[in-house]
């Protein structure tokens, strides 16, 4: 942007300026060109000896310019078109400036001027030239600086050419207010901070309803000397609720909402969620639809999932497998787990109470993914309740549960005592017992056993007694051994797992139990 | 020295048709704008044509338009007025002038011209 | 086109006289205007151009003046050959216009 202080072209001759000696050399005159008047300053003694006449502008303001540009349009004549080629006639003439902080009028005393250049034309206007009106403009600009005083004058020093100045303008620069990246920056001053540093570094101000990103730099442009706007640095971004509409943050539309400062538009308010006000950074849930602190605010609400479907409980003796199947109703949700607790019941009591401690799950029964589970340990003549509950990510946000029960009554025997009986180096006598009212449903005991640290080999004996002896075993080995009861449901609850060593060859008749 | 030497006038009947001519020496013809100028008998100066250096433009007062034809021959250093459908008001003294802008010492040309030289003239007279 | 007017149409001065002799422009002409002399029986001579620009071996007691519509020719000390009609011509439009003429007589 130009900022101009000085037009000589666009004041129609208005400005009187002084003329140095009065009433000789320089001369304000009319002419028409493109059928238009146009006002000119103009010399043309050629041929009046040497020459020094002055012509000198009004007082300019300097405003806040530093550094001001002078363009000057004017036309020299050839000094060859004059008779005898005129000898004392030039081609050049001089500029000068003189900075003051009042206006003198016309008080003109050449000493306080400072000579800025020699200005030469490019194009000189010949015989034909001016004979066909052909006006050869020649345009030079400089540049004065820095400038301190309140203002200061022009003057032009003719010393005998054939000139006419048509346009004097004197402007300066400034970068303009301008909108990048929804920041403001201010009209500023075109001034080299320093001549190793050209460029004036400007903060820009987020516009209305635009923010720093968080962590991000703030808009910085560089103010050339040219009065150009480069390198912006940084940005802003419509905030929360707002979006970018050219260079404004505009409101989001009811219906729309944005939660964050970012480039991104307004999105529509998904599923579930109550029309937004105008400006909205997020969407209510509709009643009954919850959001987890985890769900982007960009997705559909949800809610807790219904019970899950067809649970049932198949007894295995002393082990129950559970399997349902997924809800009907999801809540929308894809993280659905189920977690499933136990209850026990004495049949004798009716007393009940948890079991978790007591029974031994296939996996974690909690945070399940699976539909099924196993559950095993499970003790004789007990009644057992099991439910699966089925959650997802809002069902925390939520005081009801979604479950389903399934119960199941336990009628194997208790797990036998075993205690070892003898031993030798090749064999160990054990014996068990049970309780006298569970022995007449016991059809056979399976006795398993296997040497302590071969888990790919183990031996069967079965058994209609309270002991057995276990023969050709290898001496001072320790094995691992094992009595379950068998009845007519199946496998009743097996022992715990015994070690019992047998002698060395030159040992001593320690028993192990 | 500049001369300029008109001929061609006389005695001529209105309606009738006349060429005035203009012979140059003692300049360089072809760098100058010339120009036809007459004073009716007792009055003042009237412009009535002038042309460029090369032959053109050419231009003509309104009251002569579509009559009088302004020419000139550089290689004879001569400049004619064709004169066609003359009137009684065109008798005067016809003067041919001329212009160089070497002696215009002025930085850029007025819209027209003024005349730095001047012929004796020659009378043409328009009567029945 | 431009009207050109001059006052007065005619004066009687005595030698060494200074006279003045105005021209007015029917509207704006800036400087475009020249001024010449003619004695009886003779063709017109330039004496000013550019209102106030002397002509090449015109002697220094003439000078011109003024701008826009009001001119003026001033003889500083009228001598005997002064003794003429004199013209102003604008120029500042193709149709080139002389005023009326002014007549200096002897006194």
């Known amino acids: 942007k130009e900022v101009v202080l000085l037009d000589f072209a666009a004041m129609k001759g208005e400005l009187g300026w002084l003329t140095h000696p009065y009433g000789k050399g320089w001369d304000l005159m009319q002419n028409i060109m493109d059928d238009m008047p146009i006002y000119m300053y103009s010399v043309c003694n050629v041929v009046s000896g040497d020459q020094d006449n002055w012509l000198r502008t009004n007082w300019v303001y300097r405003e806040e310019a530093e550094r001001i540009f002078i363009e000057l349009k004017f036309t020299v004549r050839d000094c060859n078109s004059f008779p005898g080629g005129a000898s004392s006639c030039k081609e050049t003439f001089n500029l000068y400036y003189a900075e003051s902080d009042v206006d003198y009028g016309t008080n003109f005393q050449k000493r306080q001027f400072t000579k800025i250049d020699t200005i030469a034309p490019d194009e000189i206007t010949v015989s034909s030239d001016f004979e066909a009106r052909n006006v050869k403009l020649n345009v030079e600009e400089r540049m004065v600086g820095p400038l301190t005083r309140k203002g200061f004058y022009l003057a032009f020093q003719d010393i005998g050419a054939c000139v006419a100045l048509l346009s004097v303008r004197v402007y300066y620069k400034k970068c303009p207010e301008m909108l990048q990246s929804l920041a403001r920056f201010p009209e500023t001053i075109a001034v080299a901070v320093s001549d190793t540093q050209p460029l004036a570094t400007v903060a820009g101000t987020c516009v209305d309803h635009a923010v720093v990103p968080y962590g991000g730099e703030g808009p910085l442009m560089h103010c050339t000397v040219d009065g150009e706007w480069l390198v912006p640095i940084g940005q802003c971004l419509c905030q929360e609720g707002y979006e970018k509409v050219e260079d404004a943050c505009r409101a989001c539309s009811p219906g729309f909402f944005k939660s964050e400062a970012s480039e991104s538009p307004c999105l529509e308010c998904p599923e579930h969620t109550l029309p937004s006000t105008e400006g909205a950074t997020s969407c209510q849930c509709e009643e009954g639809y919850f959001r987890a602190p985890e769900d982007p605010l960009s997705m559909s609400c949800t809610r807790p999932p219904s019970a899950p479907n067809y649970l049932t409980a198949i007894g295995m003796g002393a082990k129950v497998e559970l399997r349902w199947t997924a809800p009907k109703d999801t809540g929308g949700r894809q993280d659905i787990v189920y977690s499933v607790t136990c209850e026990q019941c004495w049949p004798e009591s009716g007393e009940c109470g948890p079991c978790e401690a007591s029974v031994r799950y296939s996996e974690p029964p909690h945070a399940l993914t699976r539909t099924s589970v196993t559950v095993s340990d499970l003790e004789p003549h007990m009644n057992y309740t099991f439910a699966v509950e089925a959650r997802n990510g809002v069902s925390g946000l939520v005081t009801s549960r979604s479950f389903r029960t399934a119960s199941v009554s336990i009628n194997q025997t208790e797990p036998p005592k075993v205690r070892l009986e003898d031993r030798s180096t090749t064999s160990l006598s054990v014996t068990w017992s049970i309780p006298v009212s569970q022995q007449s449903r016991v059809w056979k005991y399976e006795v398993t056993y296997r040497k302590k640290g071969d888990a790919n080999s183990y031996n069967v004996r079965r058994t209609e007694g309270f002991s057995v002896t276990l023969d050709d075993l290898a001496p001072d080995t320790t094995y691992l051994v094992q009595v379950q009861a068998l009845t007519q449901e199946g496998q009743g609850a097996g022992s715990k797992v015994h070690e019992f060593q047998t002698l060395s060859t030159e040992g001593s008749a320690n028993m192990a139990v | 020295e500049v001369q300029l030497l008109e001929s061609g006038g006389g005695l001529v009947q209105p309606g009738g048709s006349l060429r005035l001519s203009c012979a140059a020496s003692g300049f360089t013809f072809s760098h100058y704008m010339m120009a036809w100028v007459r004073q009716a008998p007792g009055k003042g100066l009237e412009w009535v044509s002038r042309?460029?250096?090369?032959?053109?433009?050419?231009h003509y007062a309104d009251s002569v338009k579509g009559r009088f034809t302004i020419s000139r021959d550089n290689s004879k250093n001569t400049l004619y007025l064709q004169m066609n459908s003359l009137r009684a008001e065109d008798t005067a003294v016809y003067y041919c002038?001329?212009?160089?802008?070497?002696?215009?010492?002025?930085?850029?040309?007025?819209?027209?011209?003024?005349?730095?030289?001047w012929g004796q003239g020659t009378l043409v007279t328009v009567s029945s | 086109d431009i009207q050109m007017t001059q006052s007065p149409s005619s004066l009687s001065a005595s030698v060494g006289d200074r006279v003045t002799i105005t021209c007015r422009a029917s509207q704006s002409i800036s400087t475009w205007l020249a001024w010449y002399q003619q004695k009886p029986g003779k063709a017109p001579k330039l004496l000013i151009y550019k209102a106030s620009n002397l002509h090449t071996g015109v002697p220094s007691r003439f000078s011109g003046s003024g701008s826009g519509t009001e001119f003026s020719l001033t003889i500083s000390s009228l001598q005997p050959d002064d003794f003429a009609t004199y013209y102003c011509?604008?120029?500042?439009?193709?149709?080139?216009?002389f005023g009326q003429g002014t007549k200096v007589e002897i006194k």
């Open positions: 011509q604008q120029y500042n439009s193709y149709s080139r216009t």
């Open positions: 002038a001329g212009y160089d802008s070497g002696y215009d010492y002025v930085a850029v040309a007025g819209p027209a011209e003024y005349f730095q030289h």
């Open positions: 042309i460029g250096p090369s032959g053109g433009p050419t």
